[in-house]
């Protein structure tokens, strides 16, 4: 028995009561030492919780009158009073006492942090930490094993395990996300260390496998067939190829490339949006030269960490057969342009030269030719150009012609080439005076005096420089009043051969001059120089003669 510390009159045993009892439980008696048993003392309970207990007013016996729940209230602190009914007064001061509620295992373990979700990389090794789950048991941890929990895996073998005492979930077998990407694990928590009578609770853990790059991309087809028109320009996309990768996200990003293309005609670029390989024409193709190509393409992942390279040793490859499609192409001239030569003066129908165009296509269509640019030429179906008129180099030394070739099988197929015709010079023009000469001689001219310096021109082209020869015509020997001297530099000087002239008697002299060129054969012209006598006064200067309105005649002829 215990006595109240403050007042030695109260006596009781420690009070305990089992929780969750349906029957009335009497827990013990309160007694005052002053109570002599004459039934004059009355016992009373006061305080919070007094409603859960009753006391026998005469005997002081305390009983639990309600079912108690330790997890709700584990201690009841009550006050007791004893009254002497004979005097109607408390014989003791109020005393506090405690009723402790004893635990029974009436609570199962509970997981309070639900939902449990975890992410772990696929192919993680055994023992990899996934997540820790924790269950709580409301029972008294100090009473037996009521709150001692053991964890156990109800669902999740053989991929996962749980540490019994910690609730730590670990990987127990490698998992491949590409086979299964989500796992539902059920963990059971049991109290009483799993002994008979244990209560249990479960929780579900959702475990997602994150992707690692453990799959290389693989072509969907071992052979792709594509076509390209021979008229396709470089840079043309001629088709797509595609690989698949079981990984996701960045791990599925791939790059396509050419592994083998001896012709170096194609390229492959990657469309990173669609993850397709686009086959591009790098060089123009020609059906007549090569009408099919084979290339080998490969595909690799864009991002591969060093430790995962073992999954990517051999890149997947595919073969691409590319068929060139024939296009009816226009004719092709053998030369980009032609320079033909013909001497001037040739008769109508003279062959100038031949141009040639061919059909680059396999069917080799015959050609028809048309010529524009001059009416001096024509062309036949063999591409032979002939003259339709006699050509004069001095009228035109070059002709710029355009020859058009069309395929007889398809007149829409047309090509053109420039033909430049150079007309060669022949010596068909005699030299002549280079200008019109207005020649005067003074009446008082002296013998040997210079009357005129003459020069010549020749409309012909000269391979070397022209050389002209000047002579006084033999027909004109009776005219001895003037003399001609060839300067040997394509000029000649006319000198007075006498002293004094008479304007009234002989106002005009006609001097016949022969001019020859150095062509083969040489050509000579006969030219008449008209020399007018002029009254120059004392000055002996002919400059004023032209202003005197003298009548003169000048002529020349060519032989």
């Amino acid at each position: 028995d215990y006595k109240d510390d403050d007042d030695k009159a109260w006596v009781w045993r420690p009070f305990v009561v089992l929780e969750e009892m349906d029957d009335i439980q009497c827990v013990g008696k309160l007694r005052s030492d002053l109570d002599n048993g004459n039934n004059s003392f009355q016992y009373k309970l006061l305080g919070i919780g007094a409603g859960s207990f009753s006391i026998n007013e005469r005997t002081g016996e305390i009983c639990a009158i309600q079912k108690l729940d330790r997890e709700e209230k584990s201690l009841y602190i009550l006050r007791a009073q004893v009254i002497d009914t004979t005097i109607g007064k408390a014989v003791e001061t109020e005393s506090e006492f405690v009723i402790r509620v004893l635990d029974i295992n009436d609570n199962e373990p509970r997981f309070l942090d639900e939902p449990y979700e975890a992410i772990v990389p696929e192919m993680s090794p055994e023992g990899t930490f996934v997540i820790k789950v924790t269950a709580n048991d409301a029972d008294d941890p100090s009473t037996g094993y009521h709150a001692r929990i053991l964890y156990n895996l109800e669902r999740g073998q053989p991929y996962f395990s749980v540490e019994p005492t910690t609730g730590v979930i670990r990987i127990s077998s490698k998992m491949d996300r590409e086979l299964q990407d989500t796992y539902c694990v059920i963990i059971q928590a049991k109290d009483m260390l799993g002994q008979p009578g244990a209560l249990s609770g479960t929780t579900t853990v959702s475990i997602k496998l994150s992707d690692i790059n453990d799959n290389k991309p693989i072509f969907k087809e071992s052979l792709y067939r594509l076509t390209v028109s021979e008229s396709a320009p470089t840079g043309t996309s001629i088709g797509t190829i595609m690989a698949y990768d079981n990984d996701i996200g960045e791990n599925a990003e791939m790059d396509y490339s050419i592994e083998e293309d001896d012709s170096q005609t194609f390229d492959i670029i990657t469309n990173h949006e669609t993850q397709e390989g686009i086959v591009i024409l790098k060089k123009k193709v020609d059906f007549e030269h090569q009408n099919h190509y084979g290339i080998r393409a490969k595909v690799k992942n864009h991002h591969v960490p060093e430790q995962l390279m073992k999954y990517h040793t051999e890149a997947s490859t595919t073969f691409i057969k590319i068929q060139v499609e024939d296009v009816d192409e226009p004719p092709v001239f053998l030369l980009p342009y032609y320079i033909l030569e013909i001497p001037e003066g040739k008769p109508y129908g003279t062959i100038v030269g031949t141009v040639s165009a061919t059909d680059p296509d396999r069917r080799q269509s015959p050609m028809r030719y048309y010529l524009t640019g001059s009416k001096m030429f024509d062309i036949n179906d063999n591409g032979t150009i002939i003259t339709t008129n006699m050509l004069d180099r001095e009228v035109s030394a070059w002709y710029n012609l355009t020859v058009t070739a069309t395929e007889t099988y398809n007149v829409q197929q047309i090509s053109s080439a420039h033909v430049y015709v150079q007309v060669f010079n022949i010596n068909d023009n005699a030299p002549e005076f280079s200008q019109f000469y207005e020649t005067y001689v003074c009446e008082n001219a002296e013998s040997g005096e210079i009357v005129q310096i003459i020069s010549a021109i020749d409309r012909d082209e000269s391979i070397e420089d022209h050389h002209f020869y000047f002579n006084h015509s033999l027909e004109d020997t009776n005219n001895s009043s003037f003399m001609l001297t060839d300067n040997q530099d394509n000029t000649a000087v006319i000198l007075s051969n006498r002293t004094g002239f008479n304007l009234k008697e002989e106002p005009v002299f006609y001097m016949i001059i022969l001019i020859a060129d150095n062509g083969i054969p040489s050509l000579t012209s006969t030219n008449t120089l008209t020399i007018q006598v002029c009254d120059c006064g004392d000055s002996r200067n002919t400059e004023t003669c032209a202003n005197k309105g003298l009548l003169f005649i000048m002529g020349f002829r060519t032989e």
Epitope: S222, R225, T227, E288, Q290, N291, G294, K321
Partner: antibody
Framework: QVQLVESGGGVVQPGRSLRLSCAAS????????MHWVRQAPGKGLEWVAV????????YYADSVKGRFTISRDTSKNTLYLQMNSLRAEDTAVYYC????????????WGQGTLVSVSS | EIVLTQSPGTLSLSPGERATLSCRAS???????LAWYHQRPGQAPRLLIY???SRATGIPDRFSGSGSGTDFALTISSLEPEDFAVYYC????????FGQGTKVEIK
């Protein structure tokens, strides 16, 4: 195993027509380009025509262009060669051949059928 | 078109001897697109070599192909009785053309 069997050959007069057939078995016919090749008596081989795996493209040797037509019926696994305006120089053993999947050479040939053009 | 010229026209050899057959193209054959066939009398041709040097399925290793561009060769390291036949080269770079053939006969 792969088998190609030609039929339809025979004697025909110049200017007339003939149709050759080639029955294919032992492989996925619709995946392969197919060819006709001929061999004049005592002479070498001459390529005649090709048809693509799906029948969309045909190409011919210049010597037969405009006269011969190659075709295929995937449902019957059969290749055909329609020969019109036949000439004496078309006389030959006609072989059908399968083009290699990863190449353009001919990996399987039929035993051939003889076409004889004479009056 | 690409013209293939085979030489020699006839090759007379004994079994066990080495045979070298030549095939020359009139223009370069792209990507080694050249094949070799042999044809026994009364039979269809049979593919021996493709891609100038790759042996076809089931072809013994005594057959080997070489060359590129315009000059190609087929070598039979040691002739077997069944190797005496007509051999054709074929280009498939531009359309398909065959050489005129080389006859390998028993000496």
């Amino acid at each position: 195993q792969v088998q190609l069997v030609e039929s339809g050959g025979g004697v025909v007069q110049p200017g007339r027509s003939l149709r050759l057939s080639c029955a294919a078995s032992g492989f996925t016919f619709s995946s392969y380009d197919m060819h006709w090749v001929r061999q004049a008596p005592g002479k070498g081989l001459e390529w005649v025509a090709v048809i693509s795996y799906d029948g969309t493209n045909e190409y011919y040797a210049d010597s037969v262009k405009g006269r011969f037509t190659i075709s295929r019926d995937t449902s019957k696994n059969t290749l055909y060669l329609q020969m019109n305006s036949l000439r004496a120089e078309d006389t030959a053993v006609y072989y059908c051949a399968r083009e290699r999947y990863f190449d353009w050479s001919f990996d399987y040939w039929g035993q051939g059928t003889l076409v004889s053009v004479s009056s | 078109e690409i013209v293939l010229t085979q030489s020699p026209g006839t090759l007379s050899l004994s079994p066990g001897e080495r045979a070298t057959l030549s095939c020359r193209a009139s223009q370069s054959v792209s990507n080694t697109y050249l094949a070799w066939y042999h044809q026994r009398p009364g039979q269809a041709p049979r593919l021996l070599i493709y891609g100038a040097s790759s042996r076809a399925t089931g072809i013994p290793d005594r057959f080997s192909g070489s060359g590129s561009g315009t000059d190609f060769a087929l070598t039979i390291s040691s002739l077997e009785p069944e190797d005496f036949a007509v051999y054709y080269c074929q280009q498939y770079s531009n359309s398909w053309t065959f050489g005129q053939g080389t006859k390998v006969e028993i000496k």
